[in-house]
């Protein structure tokens, strides 16, 4: 029978008695930076080339005995998970191993840096097909390790890393915190976050997605035919490296941004029990479990978007938080969220020739998050149209006035500390969906984009009585690009996108009372690209 | 690999050289910063990654490393260049006393310095 982890990542159409998806990643080379490995193990023999790279610290303690099987344990298992004959994800992928972890599973930032440099030099000397680098290790936050990962990613390499086994915010660890790296948390057979001893998988906004990482059967270095169960975010990362190899083998031209968006898109959504995570991390942690795409081709027509949360701004009065998209992505909308509800909104602004999403804290606030909606939109030309606070009591309005530009997101930001208290809601005039509406004291920002075949529509869901959460989702075939709350509801904590659903959060109902001000309206902007759909049909 | 297994090699005491003239002052208004792991048990003091500014060439990296050795020698400190980085990030890995950090941060082309730290299998 199929091991639970392989079944979990396999779409139903591939599920047979044996895990045998088409094309096993044969065009892709996966680099593994880990312990030494047992390359003659039946699972990986002929699939893994051991490079001569070794940079490891001495083992701790005078009583440590180097046992070959222990030294090779972690790396052998992971190589098996990526490409093993029986229990591997991408059975056709070839691998190269670099030893950066000693027999105790310990390495150094500097050794890892030299390893990454070795990969870059190898890539320059002998360019091959797509490269995936698996980093099944973690240390404390490291500026230099993150910088090296960024450089390698910008050279076209896909880096996949373990979120860490510290039951902590992954942003406190490297390379997990590097934005360019695909960071993977671990779930178990029940789709629950993995507990390991007293700790468990890391979580938070620096995690891109989760994957199977508990009780994973793979090659054991105890003997050339042995298997063993291992657990951890390394095992989870190895699954994603295998899935990435499969995707890149099917579409070798995929960029890192495209690959990440596809990994997110094809993941199982909302299956993880979030109660395991600390309360303040639940909204920041993606509820996604990795899976292979149902077919190797034909995903290109879709408009892919993902949600990127900023770091917390901190509580000072003028504190701001910034969320950024990857270089190949377009920022299509910007929203903000504050647990205390005290915020001064958000705005899209240019920074280094690229749009970013900036959220503003308010006096007495505990801090804010900026939430960027980052999308893949080829040949896009996007700009922000701003309307300063209006004089009229009707509120502030802004629309996309350029020919062929469509509205993809609305943001509003204000200078007054407590906008909206004792003010009636401002309603959107019907029949004018291509505009953003806000308080008269607020600046309103419309994200307007022109791209071949791009069409968008506004969808609203209003609830007259106060409720902690109001949602509105885009229907099949449409992608959520913008998420905001209609103004006038003073108790709104903020808005953010979760997959294809716009979520507007309000203060605890018990504290707000059920006045007319309790009305909450979630506004979603849903888009699709006819151009991408046509291009995909022409290919097929 | 360059000097990776230098367990038995002596740390080179760099003698005063013409390299050790007046150090080029770092660009006006930019100060190199020092970083270290927030988790104390994972710190590896005594080994530092000196990261140079983005467009620094390999020859400049080597020259900066030699300058550090020379200036350290003048102060009676042993240093050892374990690796010179190029290809991903310009810079070098150096084994030295933490007392020399202030000196190293003032070297030309230096962007920041990070103390080495441990990473672990997950």
């Amino acid at each position: 029978s199929i091991p639970w982890n392989l079944e979990r990542i396999t779409p139903p159409r591939y599920r047979a008695d044996e895990y045998q998806p088409p094309d096993g990643g044969s065009l892709v080379e996966v680099y593994l930076l880990d312990t030494s490995i047992q390359s003659d193990h039946r699972e990986i023999e002929g699939r893994v080339m051991v490079t001569d790279f070794e940079n490891v610290p001495e083992e701790d303690g005078t009583r440590f005995h180097r046992q070959a099987s222990k030294c090779d344990s972690h790396g052998t298992h992971l190589a098996g998970v990526v490409s093993g004959r029986d229990a591997g994800v991408a059975k056709g992928a070839s691998m190269r191993s670099l030893r950066v972890l000693n027999c105790q599973g310990k390495g150094t930032v500097s050794g890892t840096l030299i390893g990454l440099e070795f990969i870059r030099k190898s890539q320059l000397v002998q360019p091959v097909g797509p490269l995936v680098v698996l980093l099944p290790l973690a240390g404390g936050y490291s500026r230099v390790l993150n910088a090296a990962c960024q450089r390698l990613a910008r050279a076209g390499v896909v880096l996949v890393t373990a979120a860490g086994n510290f039951r902590d915010d992954a942003c406190l660890y490297s390379p997990a915190s590097a934005p360019e790296v695909i960071t993977v948390g671990a779930t178990n057979a029940q789709d629950q976050p993995v507990t390991l001893g007293t700790l468990g998988t890391n979580f938070g906004r620096c995690v891109d997605l989760f994957a199977p990482g508990e009780d994973i059967i793979g090659a054991s270095s105890d003997c050339s035919t042995c298997f063993v169960s291992q657990s951890g975010t390394s095992q989870a990362a190895a699954h994603v490296a295998g899935i990435a190899a499969m995707m890149l083998s099917a579409e070798p031209e995929l960029t890192l941004a495209e690959l990440r968006q596809r990994l997110i898109h094809f993941s199982a959504k909302d299956v993880i029990n979030e109660a395991w995570f600390p309360e303040d991390q639940r909204v920041l942690t993606p509820n996604l479990v990795a899976a292979l795409p149902p077919s190797t081709h034909g995903a290109g027509w879709q408009l892919f978007c993902r949600t990127v949360w900023s770091a917390h701004s901190g509580p000072t009065r003028m504190a701001t938080a910034v969320a950024r998209c990857a270089p190949d992505e377009e920022l299509l909308s910007c929203s903000s969220f504050s647990r205390s509800g005290k915020r001064r909104g958000e705005r899209m602004e240019a920074q280094g020739g690229k749009l970013v999403c900036r959220a503003h804290n308010a006096f007495g606030g505990e801090g804010v998050y900026a939430i960027a909606r980052c999308c893949l939109l080829p040949q896009a030309n996007c700009s922000v149209h701003t309307a300063p606070p209006a004089e009229a009591s009707m509120g502030t309005r802004v629309h996309c006035h350029q020919q062929g530009h469509v509205l993809t997101g609305c943001s509003s930001h204000w200078e007054v500390e407590d906008l909206g208290t004792h003010k009636p809601p401002v309603l959107r005039p019907r029949g004018q969906p291509n505009q953003c509406v806000g308080h008269r004291e607020a600046s309103i920002h419309a994200s307007c984009c022109h791209a071949p075949g791009l069409e968008c529509k506004v969808k609203e869901h209003g609830i007259p009585a106060p409720q902690e959460q109001v949602t509105v989702a885009c229907e099949e075939g449409w992608t959520l690009t913008g998420c905001s709350a209609l103004p006038g509801t003073s108790h709104v904590l903020g808005a953010y996108a979760v997959d294809n659903t716009c979520v507007v959060r309000s203060r605890d109902v018990s504290t707000t009372g059920s006045t007319s001000e309790g009305a909450v309206t979630a506004v979603a902007i849903c888009c699709r690209s006819r151009h991408l759909a046509q291009a995909s049909q022409e290919l097929q | 690999q360059e000097d990776e297994d230098g367990d038995y090699e002596e740390l080179v005491l760099a003698l005063r050289s013409e390299e050790d003239g007046l150090a080029e002052a770092p660009e006006h208004g930019t100060t190199a910063t020092f970083h270290r792991c927030a988790k104390d048990p994972w710190r590896l003091p005594g080994t530092y990654v000196v990261v140079l500014k983005e467009e620094t060439h390999l020859s400049q990296s080597e020259r900066t490393a030699r300058r550090l050795q020379a200036q350290a020698a003048r102060r009676g400190y042993l240093t050892k260049i374990l690796h010179v980085f190029h290809g991903l990030l310009p810079g070098f890995l150096v084994k030295m006393s933490g007392d020399l950090l202030e000196l190293a941060l003032k070297l030309p082309h230096v962007d920041y310095i990070e103390e080495d730290s441990s990473v672990f299998a997950q």
């Epitope: 344990s73 029986d86 105790q104 599973g105 700790l199 059967i217 298997f227 063993v228 169960s229 | 672990f120």
Partner: antibody, heavy 130, light 107 residues
Framework: EVQLVESGGGLVQPGGSLRLSCAAS????????MSWVRQAPGKGLEWVAN????????YYVDSVKGRFTISRDIAKNSLYLQMNSLRAEDTAVYYC???????????????????????WGQGTTVTVSS | DIQMTQSPSTLSASVGDRVTITCRAS??????LAWYQQKPGKAPKLLIY???SLESGVPSRFSGSGSGTEFTLTISSLQPDDFATYYC?????????FGQGTKLEIK
């Protein structure tokens, strides 16, 4: 689905020997530690012995040390218990069980996380009597 | 060797009752404790591992708690299928010991 089937039980005289076998179906047999557990008539459970995946480590309850030997054959997906110098108090139903556990790493190194005996055989009866 | 002591030895209860079985270890075993259910003539079945983690497929009315030397198994609302003998088991350095068992019978 992993299944365990014990065999080899029977009636034996005190001082005699018996070899119990446990046949496993399912790929995961070789991936876990395995145990033998016994239950004397009308009594509770008693753990007897266990063995690592590759057979390199074995542990026994004090009362059987030097008399019983646990072994496994990965190629045959089988677990064995060789019982020598049998005594009346060894009379029991003998179960083989899979010790579900997993290895993981943290900053302290390699660790073992134990879940428990999650798959059991139906048992085989051993009677030691003259 | 670590001894495990279960109490009570026998427990009479009715369907719908909330019942608690206690297990004490002779020395600290951290959270390395499992609970099993056994019905006459059948092999034991794993219910709880690591003191409080519910094994897959086990009804949520079963729960475990405790650490160190004191552990409890609780059945929140007894069902007819729950009348059986329950055993605790400690894991310590690859060798195990079971408690003597608690027989849960219909009142």
């Amino acid at each position: 689905e992993v299944q365990l089937v014990e065999s080899g039980g029977g009636l034996v005289q005190p001082g005699g020997s018996l070899r119990l076998s446990c046949a496993a179906s399912g790929i995961t047999f070789s991936s876990y530690w395995m145990s033998w557990v016994r239950q004397a008539p009308g009594k509770g459970l008693e753990w007897v012995a266990n063995i690592k995946q590759d057979g390199s480590e074995k542990y026994y309850v004090d009362s059987v040390k030097g008399r019983f030997t646990i072994s496994r054959d990965i190629a045959k997906n089988s677990l064995y218990l060789q019982m020598n110098s049998l005594r009346a108090e060894d009379t029991a139903v003998y179960y083989c069980a899979r010790d579900r556990g997993t290895y993981y790493y943290d900053s302290g190194g390699y660790n073992y996380y134990y879940y428990g005996m999650d798959v059991w055989g139906q048992g085989t009866t051993v009677t030691v009597s003259s | 060797d670590i001894q495990m002591t279960q109490s009570p030895s026998t427990l009479s209860a009715s369907v719908g009752d909330r019942v608690t079985i206690t297990c004490r270890a002779s020395q600290s075993i951290s959270s390395w404790l499992a609970w099993y259910q056994q019905k006459p003539g059948k092999a034991p079945k794993l219910l709880i591992y690591k003191a409080s983690s519910l094994e897959s497929g086990v009804p949520s009315r079963f729960s475990g708690s405790g650490s160190g030397t004191e552990f409890t198994l609780t059945i929140s609302s007894l069902q007819p299928d729950d009348f059986a003998t329950y055993y605790c088991q400690q894991y310590n350095s690859y060798s195990y010991t079971f408690g003597q068992g608690t027989k849960l019978e219909i009142k």
